[in-house]
């Protein structure tokens, strides 16, 4: 049977010393000192006599001589079963047993819930000797106790290599309900049931459960540990905590923010950082995210011309990195951009729209009706073309590159000239007699260059061979012209 | 030409709620926020919100979170601010205005007057 | 938020001469070279009418007279030379973040 002993219980002295199987509580100290989790063994040093095996909870003696009385098994005597006490109270137990003196050695060791206890604990073992036994009494002392002080504490001792194990003490801490589980902030759905969860724990047993938003308790009766409160929706962010009632009072849970996914506010700082002929790199800052993670944004681009007519060119994204290229753009236009989050309840608003410009783009339309001719008495060849029809997107003109390339028996080579934008004719030396000269132009703006007419050749023949007749592009979709002379 | 039509005049009691349209034409209407402001009599311009009707998401000046909510219908080109528990604070003339950098073109307002 | 804070509250401008409105910025709302920063003119009984745009652009059908500029957070509201038609109440606004503000408003006089 379990002695339980309760922290009002009174030792009762039978020899000097902390009495076997007493509970001693002292209440002097209540002061906290710091717990360890060891015990320094005692050793108990007495004639030399060999031992026997050991045989379980109990060491039998072997005789003493021939003939001689056996010896009473050594065991450990009883003590109180269970102490019962509140957190923070000092607590004193210990277990005792007499040795007969024929035994050296001895070492008594206390263990809690199979582990032994190691180190720095305050654990005090006396030596009370007598003719024939020694009365060996091990004390142990808990100063401030704490849950973690609960458990089944017991003595061993061990007698040349044989143990003997004490009954079980069972040390009970009682104090304010302690949390095992609390309510854990959520971002829910508007009008969306939820549960909440709270379990707390003694001893002492029962803990009930009250459940409080936002100051004001939520349940009439309480509900025993754990505890589910299903809430049937909100409209407007809460505040919920719980409280965990036993016998020594109560304890609150910290207060659990529940947050009502909304739609994210829209992003900021929409800022440019590249612009080209064609494409605008853009970054934000994501604005508040309404409780619930973004999803993708949405780029919405519009040009910004009184004649343009388009509609908003719409481009999807990931929601991270912060940063997209827009790209098809035409090159020298305004462009109004704005950027949009969403998340799971819906759409940011679009941020507030800025604008960017595209720079100046490269020709896209190559210079007309090139023609080209010998003028042999200068030694060179003459070349003529149209102004292209560029579009004001491209930028101004500045320039135009001539191509040629001079071809004759097993050379070829490429020469290319830079002209002004006021420019429509062109002179370029003979490189090779006896060869073909193939020419091509392309318009230049500060966008690039543009492409390149399609190619005329004209045939420069060796010294003496005269003719004027020009070399000239072909009307759109014939072949490439070659003159023959 | 860009127009914003707006209704006529409203008289509403304490508490209660009114919708007001403002109908465009003459655009792309999913292609332009639509912002409203308001103005007390005799006071400066207040900004209200914005609503982009291509995603309709929605934004609100703080002051009148709670007070006003933004819808627009796509079909018939027509944007709404609803403005509900009205007190004479409410009391004013609310525009509807094509949002891009600045507010080029204006419904020519709805006036509220809550009274008992 | 922004505050723009727009001076003078009332201005009286003989016909002809120059009338001078200003809207200072808490804060810049200029990015990526451009300032969203807009002027806006209301007659009594009419909605606002939109006469300048991103600080110093001239909006479609206003006269040339009417110019804006800008020098730091300041921003300027010129008209030169002005006329009878020009008195109204004229506002500043931005459009650089939410929410969008507006000045408090200039009520120009002709005399």
């Known amino acids: 049977a379990i002695t339980e002993a309760r922290e009002e219980a009174k030792p009762y002295p039978l020899f000097p010393g902390p009495l076997p199987g007493s509970l001693q509580t002292d209440h002097t100290s209540l002061l906290s000192l710091p717990h360890t989790s060891g015990y320094q063994p005692a050793l108990m040093f007495s004639p030399t006599q060999p031992g026997r095996p050991y045989t379980g909870n109990v060491a039998i003696p072997r005789v003493t001589s021939a003939g001689s009385k056996l010896l009473p098994p050594l065991a450990f005597k009883h003590t109180v079963g269970h102490i019962i006490l509140s957190e923070h109270k000092d607590v004193k137990f210990n277990c005792s047993i007499s040795v007969p003196n024929i035994y050296q050695d001895t070492t008594i060791s206390w263990w809690k819930d199979g582990k032994e206890l190691l180190g720095a604990h305050h654990a005090i073992t006396q030596f009370y000797p007598d003719d024939e036994v020694t009365a060996i009494i091990a004390s142990f002392s808990i100063t401030s106790v704490q849950r973690s002080d609960n458990g089944s504490y017991i003595c061993k001792m061990k007698i040349n290599n044989e143990e003997i194990v004490s009954d079980p003490i069972y040390i009970e801490v009682q104090g304010l309900p302690h949390f095992t589980k609390q309510p854990e902030s959520m971002n829910v759905t508007r009008n969306t049931a939820f549960n909440l969860t709270c379990q707390a724990v003694g001893p002492p047993e029962p803990v009930n459960i009250f459940w409080v938003q936002n100051s004001s308790r939520v349940n009439e009766q309480p509900e025993k540990s754990p505890s589910v409160l299903t809430v049937p929706g909100l409209t407007e962010m809460a505040v919920f905590s719980c409280e965990a009632h036993n016998d020594k009072g109560l304890t609150v849970s910290k207060g659990v923010q529940i947050n009502i996914k909304a739609i994210p506010s829209p992003p900021t700082e929409v800022s440019i950082h590249n612009s080209t002929a064609h494409s605008i790199l853009i970054s934000w800052v994501p604005g508040f995210d309404g409780y619930s993670p973004f999803r993708n944004c949405s780029v919405q681009v519009k040009e910004v011309d009184p004649l343009s007519n388009g509609s908003v060119m719409i481009f999807n994204t990931s929601a991270s990195p912060h940063m997209y290229q827009i790209k098809q753009l035409q090159a020298l236009a305004n462009y109004s951009i704005g950027v949009s989050c969403m998340n799971e309840i819906g759409w940011s608003a679009v941020s507030p729209w800025i604008l960017a410009s595209t720079t100046e783009g490269a020709p896209s339309v190559a210079p007309l009706n090139v023609t080209v001719f010998l003028n042999e008495s200068r030694d060179n060849v003459d070349i003529r073309w149209m102004k292209p029809l560029t579009k004001r997107q491209a930028g101004e003109l500045v320039g135009y590159r001539i191509s040629h390339v001079w071809q004759s028996a097993g050379i070829s080579k490429e020469l290319l000239e830079e002209v002004g934008q006021n420019n429509s004719r062109a002179q370029i030396s003979v490189q090779v007699h006896n060869a073909t000269c193939t020419v091509r132009i392309a318009a230049v703006t500060k966008g690039g260059v543009g492409p390149f007419s399609d190619p005329v050749k004209i045939f420069i023949p060796a010294h003496g061979w005269v003719d004027h007749a020009p070399s000239s592009t072909p009307a759109p979709g014939n072949a490439d012209p070659v003159l023959i002379i | 030409e860009v127009q914003l039509q707006q209704s006529g005049p409203e008289l509403v009691k304490p508490g209660a709620s009114v919708r007001i349209p403002c109908k465009a034409s003459?655009?792309?209407?999913?292609?332009?926020?639509m912002d409203w402001v308001k103005q007390s009599h005799g006071k400066s311009l207040e900004w209200i919100g914005n609503?982009?009707?291509?995603?309709?998401?929605?934004i609100y000046s703080q002051k009148f979170k709670g007070k006003a909510t933004l819808t627009v219908d796509k079909s018939s080109s027509t944007a709404y601010m609803e403005l509900r528990s009205l007190t004479s604070e409410d009391t004013a003339v609310y525009y509807c205005a094509r949002g891009d950098y600045g507010f080029a073109s204006w419904g020519q307002g709805t006036l509220v007057t809550v009274s008992a | 938020d922004i505050v723009l804070t727009q001076s003078p509250a009332s201005l009286t401008v003989s016909l002809g001469q120059r009338a001078t409105i200003s809207c200072r910025a808490s804060r810049s709302v200029s990015t990526s070279g451009y300032s969203y920063m807009h002027w806006y003119q209301q007659k009594p009984g009419q909605p606002p009418k939109l006469l300048i745009y991103l600080a110093s652009n001239l909006e479609s059908g206003v006269p040339a007279r009417f110019s804006g500029s800008r020098s730091g957070t300041d921003f300027t509201l010129n008209i030169h030379p002005v006329e009878e038609e020009d008195a109204a109440t004229y506002y500043c606004?931005?459009?650089?973040?939410?929410?969008?503000?507006f000045g408090s408003g200039t009520k120009l006089e002709i005399k």
């Open positions: 609503i982009n009707p291509n995603i309709g998401g929605t």
């Open positions: 003459g655009y792309t209407f999913s292609d332009y926020n």
């Open positions: 606004q931005h459009s650089r973040e939410y929410p969008f503000t």
